[in-house]
Structures are given as C-alpha cells and as structure tokens.
C-alpha cells in the first residue's frame, strides 16, 4: 500500500481466483485514543473499533472510503483505490490502447517545435467517475522538472455504438534548450482513476521523436504564363522554432483530385515555393517535416486549383 | 576550416556533407526509428557518446559569438561515431547486408571531421569506451541504439552548418 | 495487367513527319498520366513531353516546342505523338510510359523504332 | 534545365560484389530521382522512386540513398540479370531530364 495523495491510498493486489489480497491496517487521525468506530462509505455498517482498524483487501467491495468517528463526529477519512496486477501485469482497462505507433500505445504525445512544449493525450470509453493526474520530468534517475498542466476533455466522438472521450494535456520543460541534442529523454506518468480502480501509465519519448510541425501557411498560387504549370509559395508555420536557417523544414507538394486514387502530381522542396501543374477539379496541398531528423509530417495545408 | 586562430570552417561544403550525412545515417537503419530502443535497457552503453549540450555554443547565438567551441564538439563527435562504425561492433558477426550504408556514411563522418580539422592540428578526442558485445543479438541491438544517436547528432551538426551557411559564410 | 503497345517501325524522309500510336489496356485510360520518351541508337533517354488523357492538357520539352503533338483518343484508349519536320538526327526509339504520378515512369511500351534517312 | 552526369560511364563488377552507381544533379533536386534500368533492347524499367522508396516486386537488393545533389544507387549482390544500364532521372522540374546512364558489365 502508498499513499497517492493526502487520505488517498493505493493498495497493490495480485488479482486472480481466491486470491488472498492484502491485509491493510488503517489508522485513524486523531489524538482520541478510545470510542473509535469505522464505517464503509454510506454505510453505517460498523467495521470496527479502536484507533486502529486491520482488514484483508481482496476486491473491489473491500475498498472505497473508510472512516473513523466519535461519537457522532468524523474524525478523518482513508480512501482505498486498487491496483490490479494480473498475470504479473498492471491492467490497463481505463485507457483505450491507440495501437499507433506500435501495439499497447495508451499515451500519445506531439510537440509543435523544439521548445520543449508538448501535449499529450489519450482514450477512454468511461464518461464519469474518471480523473487524471499528470506528472512529468526530463530523465528519472536524477529528474530535470517539467511543467503539466490539468488533463482536461479536448474531444468526443461516436465509435460504432460507443461514445470515446480524448483528455489532453500541456506540459513545458522548464530549462528548454532547442538548440540541444536531447540525451535523456521525457518522461510521462499519468495516474488514472475511475470510481476505485487506479492505474498509472507511462511514456518516454526525446523531443526530437514527437515532432509534428504544424502545417505551411499562407499558401498562394501564381499561374505561369503560356504553362498548365503554377507557382505556389507558402510560409512556415508560426508555431515553428526560430531561426529558420538553424531549424529549418523541408515540404512536400502534391496535386491531386479528391480521390486518393486519381492520378497526381508531386515534388519535395527544401524551398517555400515549387512549380507543379493544376489539374480542373484538383486540390495543391504542401505539408512540412523537419529536414534533418525524420520526425512526422504536418497535416497537409490546401488550396483548390481553380 | 576550422583551425587554431578561429577561421571559419568551409560553411557550405560543410553544410552539405552533414546533409548527406543525416540521409545516410536514416538510411542506415530507417526501421531504427520504429524500435523503441529505450525500453531495451542497458542505457549505459550509449551514455557515453558525446551529445551536443546546452553549453556548447552549438545554438545560433553560441555560433554568432564564437562558433569554435561548438566546431570543436562536433569534431569530437564526428571522430568518436567514426571511430564506433569502424569497430567490431560493426564490422563483427552479424555481418551487416551488402548494402548497407553503414560504409558510406563511415566515410563520410571521416571527410566531414577532416573539413573541420586539417591535417597538423588536433583537437583533443574523446575516448571510445571499449564496448565489445558478447552475442550477436547485443551486438545488433548496439548498433541500433549507436545509429539512433548518430541521427540525433548529425541532425544538430546538419542544423549548425546549415545557420552557418547561411550567416556566417564570408 | 497495366500494358502498353506501341506501333511499329517507321522510315522516314527528312522534313517528312511520323505518328507513333501507344495502346493502353489493363487499367482505366484517363488514371495515368502518358509521357514520350525517345532514345537515339547507343544514346541515352530523352524525355519529350506528357498528355493528360483526362483533358488534352500537354507539357513539351523546350527542345520539341512547335514540332511535336501529344494527342490521345479515349474511345479506342490510345495515344499518339506526332512528330514533324523530321531530321536525321530524330532517329531513335520512341517510348511511351505511364504513371499515376507524374514526374516519373512506372509503365512503358515496348518502343517503336523511327529511322531518318533519305 | 537540369543536367544529371552519371559516374561512372561503365562499371565492370563480378557476380557477387557490390556494385555502386553514383549521379549527381547541376543544382539541388531535394529527392526528386528515380532510378531506371534497361537491358539490350528491351524499355527501360523502374527500380526506384523519389531517392530511396523501393518499387514492389524489385528485388531488395537494389537500394537508393541521397539528397539534393549526389545520388547513389546500390546493388548489394549482383546477379547475372542486373547487368545492363542505369539511369537516373530528375523529376524536381521540367522538362524531365535523365543522366547519360552507367553500363554494369561483367568483369
């Protein structure tokens, strides 16, 4: 058993058939040292007597909040969440595996630029009952501090018959150095409660592996004269590290109709511009990636041909 | 070049070359990006290598002020990864397929290092910790793990001679 | 499978012009992007221009400009160049590919062989 | 236009060994190069596109690497078929232009 919080305890339980559970002595805090009596949640059920109260946490039922009173009075409160190790392995039922970019992925985290500011989200299916804590830090043996905001709902949306929730979060590193080759990597705890199940997930990542620029700006055509051919220019995006002759993108452009089958035309460019050819009916699109590290592409930015 | 009196280096030639050199080092192992290496353990094989730090000057106000102490690190690095890839725990069993990259961009962390450091002056070097591997199994994991951080050094260098070339250049 | 058949040789005068047809099957005529390239006997590959099928839009060399047609007829899925004004020096095989994409060539004819000569 | 000089104009190389054909472009090309290879009288046919992204149903033995200006095709193991000549082709603007080639012959 340790404490989460303040009157918050996790108690740790090998979780199969019969098994034993762990046995958990609660102490109630107080100086009174007799006409001590505990309750479970809203029962009035008396557990126990006694400044101390010993029981054998085996499931779900054994937890919740237990409380100590005198005489009518709450003296304090210990609430037991559970933690479920099944075939040596803690359970992930809270969170939705995203599968993306390998198989058991709960937490997914991006970063815009090299500033040492990311955002990390995940999913689940439960609606209520549900809270999230978020810590974080740069390495673990000897930790450099980073900054999490409140996880906070960013999305739902209808999968089949079940609604899924997305929570995100903001963090910042608080001595970012952009310019560094990063040789600890970040580490992600997130704590999760629904009603009295606990689990905790984690992820560990370099800066340099969740960058996603955001898309080119200000796209702009220009048509050549007596040519199907057309210059399109575009910016970087605001969000991305400064200067750009030190973190500089490269760009990928393409022309295509609405169908990813059509036929299309595509250049990559170092350059905030590039000559392709306009089709009726078709769309030019650039999308962004850092030229030297091969992280993600940004989202594609479009404009139509016509 | 950069040499002793603090000329600058071939900006240009060098931004070039470490360009190349990220290509290489991501064609060299580009499945190295889909394994999640840390979770392999044993960090302390890769901890030596020589990472460019906050302190290095290697940021573009570092290299506005005096882009030496940054030049000097990157050579350090250049030197030490060209040291690993000769080693045996690239040129030991298993033997890497035919055409693997690994030797061009063996020779090109080498021209890159001797364009910043002409002959008759040296830098002092950092020292190649003995890594020698038992299993092929380690020694392919090694690799993996050395490739991984040689994308992330050049990544920075290619970011250094890039800037250079572009506003430091006479 | 995607197949292109090209027409067959042709001799021809100087200042004569020559129209090579290219046959498309296996896949839907205006999905592809067809290009004409040509190859002089011993020389390398010379890239003359693309047609849309879809709509007729052409691109040629700077080189073929005024002396070369791209056209294609979708009812019999065939394309044609048509070059004129013939030279020795246009003696060559003459390719056409295809490609989705349209910067490069995933599918070719087997070539037709254009000899200038008086 | 762009010219693409291919080196070396031939290259004679055992069955077995490793063969490297180099190109390189008049000006920064990003990886905008496709490779091509041709045998005596057939059309020439696709290996490689956009650098490095292989084709299917080409043996893995062929492989591209670079950026911007210099170019690499590799074929780590050569087999009797792959003795013929390769092209590269820029395709970073028009017109389209292709390098003279590289002969891979028998030694």
């Known amino acids: 058993i340790w404490e989460l919080k303040k009157d918050v305890y996790v108690v740790e339980l090998d979780w199969y058939p019969d098994a034993p559970g762990e046995m958990v002595v609660l102490t109630c805090d107080t100086p009174e040292e007799d006409g001590i009596t505990w309750t479970l949640d809203q029962s009035s059920e008396v557990l126990g007597s006694g400044k101390t109260l010993t029981i054998q946490v085996k499931e779900f039922g054994d937890a919740g909040q237990y409380t100590c009173h005198k005489g009518g009075e709450v003296l304090s409160h210990s609430l037991l969440l559970l933690h479920k190790k099944e075939d040596g392995i803690w359970s992930t039922d809270i969170l939705k595996d995203q599968k993306e970019p390998k198989n058991k992925t709960f937490l997914r985290c991006e970063a815009k630029n090299y500033s040492g500011r990311f955002t990390c989200w995940w999913l689940t299916t439960i609606s209520t009952d549900l809270t999230f804590s978020v810590k974080s830090s740069r390495g673990s043996s000897d930790p450099q501090g980073v900054t999490c905001g409140a996880a906070t709902l960013s999305a739902e949306r209808v999968r089949g018959d079940n609604k899924e929730y997305e929570y995100s979060v903001e963090c910042q590193e608080d001595s970012a150095c952009p310019a560094a080759e990063e040789s600890l990597p970040i580490e992600v705890m997130v704590d999760a409660v629904h009603k009295l199940k606990y689990e905790n997930y984690t992820s560990s990542f370099f800066i340099r592996d969740i960058i996603k620029p955001d898309p080119p700006k200000n796209l702009q055509l220009k048509p050549l004269k007596n040519s199907r051919q057309v210059e399109v220019s575009w910016e970087y995006p605001d969000t991305w590290s400064t200067p750009h002759s030190y973190f500089s993108l490269t760009f990928c452009v393409q022309v295509q109709g609405k169908s990813k089958r059509e036929k299309k035309d595509r250049v990559f460019t170092d350059k905030t511009s590039a000559t392709v050819i306009c089709r009726k009916n078709a769309s030019i699109s650039v999308r962004a990636q850092d030229r030297y590290y091969s992280s993600s592409w940004s989202e594609w930015a479009s404009v139509p041909c016509s | 070049r950069a040499v002793p009196g603090g000329s600058s280096p071939a900006w240009t030639q060098c931004q070039q070359l470490s360009q190349k050199l990220c290509t290489l080092a991501w064609s060299a192992h580009p499945l190295v990006g889909h394994m999640d290496l840390r979770e392999e353990g044993d960090e302390e094989t890769t901890n030596d290598v020589p990472h460019i730090q906050c302190g290095d000057g290697c940021d573009p106000q570092g290299l506005r002020d005096n882009s030496q102490f940054c030049l000097q690190r990157i050579h350090q690095g250049l030197i030490f990864y060209e040291k690993l890839l000769g080693s045996d725990i690239f040129t030991g069993e298993p033997s890497l397929l035919p055409d693997s990259p690994v030797g061009q961009l063996h020779a090109s962390l080498l021209g890159l290092s001797q364009l910043l450091q002409p002959e008759g002056h040296h830098w002092e070097t950092q020292q190649i910790p003995s890594l020698s591997p038992s299993q092929p199994w380690q020694r392919l994991l090694l690799r993996f793990k050395i490739l991984r951080s040689l994308q992330a050094f050049v990544a920075v260098a290619a970011r250094v001679f890039a800037h250079g070339a572009a506003t430091l250049s006479p | 499978q995607v197949q292109l058949v090209q027409s067959g040789a042709e001799v021809k005068k100087p200042g004569a012009s020559v129209k090579v047809s290219c046959k498309a099957s296996?896949?839907?005529?205006?999905?592809?992007?067809l290009h004409w390239v040509r190859q002089a006997p011993g020389q390398g590959l010379e890239w003359m221009g693309w047609?849309?099928?879809?709509?007729?839009?052409?691109e040629y060399a700077p080189k073929f400009q005024g002396r070369v047609t791209m056209t294609t007829d979708t009812s019999t899925s065939t394309a044609y160049m048509e070059l004129r004004s013939l030279r020795s020096d246009d003696t060559a095989v003459y390719y056409c590919?295809?490609?989705?994409?349209?910067?490069?060539?995933?599918?070719w004819g087997q070539g037709t062989m254009v000899t200038v000569s008086s | 236009e762009i010219v693409m000089t291919q080196s070396p104009a031939t290259l004679s190389v055992s069955p077995g060994e490793r063969a490297t054909l180099s190109c390189r472009a008049s000006q920064s090309i990003s990886i905008n190069l496709h490779w091509y290879q041709q045998k005596p009288g057939q059309a020439p046919r696709l290996l490689i596109y956009f650098a490095s992204q292989s084709i299917s149903g080409i043996p893995a033995r062929f492989s591209g690497s670079g950026s911007g200006t210099e170019f690499t095709l590799t074929i780590s193991s050569l087999q009797s078929e792959d003795f013929a000549v390769y092209y590269c082709?820029?395709?970073?603007?028009?017109?389209?232009?292709f390098g003279g080639g590289t002969k891979v012959e028998i030694k």
């Open positions: 590919a295809a490609n989705k994409e349209l910067r490069y060539f995933d599918v």
């Open positions: 296996g896949y839907t005529f205006t999905d592809y992007y």
């Open positions: 047609i849309d099928p879809e709509n007729g839009d052409t």
């Open positions: 082709q820029q395709s970073n603007s028009f017109p389209l232009t």
